[in-house]
């Protein structure tokens, strides 16, 4: 969840006090502080909607609120893919899209959001209490996942409000490049704060919060985010899981039914590793098959950010994964 730093409203310095430089010195630390707190904490939202016309039809929409480039999106149901969930679709920004029944059409809605239409009947159709999860692998944030489902009382045609990451997994909360810049900024911020402590305090109104309070507050996880980290995986009604995973692509119009690779299992006890090889905790940056996703041992695509700085132990194609299947 995004933790916003509460930036106190600073009184404009009186003329002759610190002038323009003083104002910049006061504002810069808080801007940096906000960046330090919010950077590296992208958010994934999931929205599940049951279509009014077909009660067995669901539309799942997922989005990634982050500044990085998305290298892979995996949609699963019945919980996170590695924790008993079944992969429904995998979307790679350049290589293509893979789907498995009962997914009917997966597509990119924007560069950072996707939608998936599910439909079916009988055992392979979803039901209202099914949990749907979306996992976004991005550079440089790493891998983030959120799950959502329709509220039990949802009326057909209504959608559950977007759920911001009930299950958030930061396989990497920030990778070298950006992290380095942020680290520098944070160090600089601390340096400014220390200098600030040794100077006469600027004339802020007494009622204003002192810098120490917001600083402590900004760095402490919010109650919401703490709660999010403790939400257990939702219980799955297995009767809603697909009974058959066999699909055919008719010759008529373009069909989106296809098999998807499945992601590396999320281990319930800790951050999921995208790759299947053992990786140090929180270091499972997805490397997608080439391109933006350096697969185990391979060069990143020429057009994407170079991920070779963070090679997957398996080599360049590690990220290929679903679409590889992981």
């Amino acid at each position: 969840m995004r933790t916003e730093a509460q930036v106190p409203a600073l009184q404009p310095p009186e003329p002759g006090l610190e002038g323009a430089m003083g104002h910049r010195t006061l504002v810069l630390p808080w801007v940096l502080l906000t960046l330090c707190v919010t950077a590296g904490t992208p958010e994934v939202w999931v929205q599940v909607r049951m279509e009014a016309t077909e009660l067995s039809s669901f539309t799942i929409r997922c989005g990634f609120l982050g500044s990085g480039s998305i290298s892979l999106v995996t949609v699963s149901w019945g919980g996170p893919n590695g924790a008993g969930g079944t992969t429904l679709a995998v979307l790679h920004p350049e290589r293509g899209i893979r789907q498995w029944a009962p997914a009917r059409q997966a597509r990119w809605e924007t560069q950072s959001s996707i939608s998936l239409i599910l439909e079916g009947s009988g055992a392979s159709s979803p039901c209202a209490n099914t949990t749907f999860c979306c996992k976004f692998a991005s550079f440089p944030e790493g891998s983030w996942e959120a799950c959502g489902s329709l509220p039990p009382s949802s009326d057909p045609g209504l959608s559950a409000p977007p759920t911001p990451a009930p299950i958030l997994r930061a396989d990497l909360a920030g990778i070298l490049g950006v992290s380095g810049v942020l680290l520098f900024g944070c160090v600089y911020l601390l340096h400014l704060l220390r200098r600030h402590k040794h100077r006469p305090a600027p004339r802020l109104q007494p009622s204003r919060t002192s810098p120490q309070a917001p600083r402590a507050r900004a760095w402490a996880p919010s109650q919401a985010s703490q709660a999010a980290l403790h939400v257990p995986y939702a219980t799955i009604n297995t009767s809603c899981r697909p009974a058959t995973l066999d699909t055919a692509h008719p010759h008529g119009g373009p069909s989106w039914w296809a098999s998807l690779p499945t992601h590396a299992a999320h281990r319930p006890q800790g951050p999921a590793a995208w790759a299947s090889t053992p990786i140090p905790a929180r270091g499972s940056f997805v490397s997608v098959e080439n391109g933006l996703y350096a697969q185990a041992g391979e060069r990143p695509p020429h057009t994407g950010p170079g991920l070779t700085l963070f090679p997957d132990p398996r080599g360049p194609r590690a990220m290929e994964g679903p679409l590889g299947v992981r």
Epitope: R98, R107, L245, S255, S259, L323, G324
Partner: antibody, heavy 114, light 113 residues
Framework: EVQLQQSGPELVKPGASVKISCKAS????????MNWVKQSHGKSLEWIGD????????SYNQKFKGKATLTVDKSSSTAYMELRSLTSEDSAVYYC???????WGQGTLVTVSA | DIVMTQSPSSLSVSAGEKVTLSCKSS????????????LAWYQQKPGQPPKLLIY???TRESGVPDRFTGSGSGTDFTLTISSVQAEDLALYYC?????????FGSGTKLDIK
């Protein structure tokens, strides 16, 4: 190093069935779906279908539905394709290829002849 | 199904020359949501399986020489070999990676004079 090793050439009679294999190594087999592609002599490539080794889920090109059956054996990291009711039209080289077609097996030549 | 049409069916060039191969699809391969074209190019040498050269219409696969360049959008795509080498003698296929079933072009055979 990722490798896909396919079984050897097959000479089969019309109406019979054949099962060809593709053994994967150098990566975690269940992490990547496997495609199968047909290439008739002197002709182009046709996508047959693919399978998710994790749960056996399959996806087929309608043209090959009923002709090809895809399966996997996770314990041996091997994908299989069975072709049935063979005719001369099925004579071709069949390839397995990992998802996104970045890695291919060497191909298996199937010849259907009386 | 999406039909992929390649031209020319064959061509013969001298080493060092620039070559342009064309591929047209019967439907757009552009994904409007993320503005990416789902088209791939493969090279197949005699007696070998195809090798992925380009995906996403223009992204080179790892290890592919930079003399190979993919371009185009929508329904018209091009594979350019800036300076043909003797080892480039092969069949070149384009592929629809946009929607199922995946379909391939009939191929362009490149001969070296």
């Amino acid at each position: 190093e990722v490798q896909l090793q396919q079984s050897g050439p097959e000479l089969v009679k019309p109406g019979a069935s054949v099962k060809i294999s593709c053994k994967a190594s150098g990566y975690t087999f269940t992490d990547y779906s496997m495609n199968w592609v047909k290439q008739s002599h002197g002709k182009s490539l046709e996508w047959i279908g693919d399978i998710n080794p994790n749960n056996g889920g399959t996806s087929y090109n309608q043209k090959f539905k009923g002709k090809a059956t895809l399966t996997v054996d996770k314990s041996s990291s091997t994908a299989y394709m069975e072709l049935r009711s063979l005719t001369s039209e099925d004579s071709a080289v069949y390839y397995c290829a990992r998802v996104w077609f970045a890695y291919w097996g060497q191909g298996t030549l199937v010849t259907v002849s009386a | 199904d999406i039909v992929m049409t390649q031209s020319p069916s064959s061509l013969s060039v001298s080493a060092g020359e620039k070559v342009t191969l064309s591929c047209k699809s019967s439907q757009s391969l552009l994904n409007s949501g993320n503005q990416k074209n789902y088209l791939a190019w493969y090279q197949q040498k005699p007696g070998q399986p195809p090798k992925l050269l380009i995906y996403g219409a223009s992204t080179r696969e790892s290890g592919v020489p930079d003399r190979f360049t993919g371009s185009g959008s929508g329904t018209d795509f091009t594979l350019t070999i800036s300076s043909v080498q003797a080892e480039d003698l092969a069949l070149y296929y384009c592929q629809n990676a946009h929607s199922y079933p995946f379909t391939f072009g009939s191929g362009t055979k490149l001969d070296i004079k």
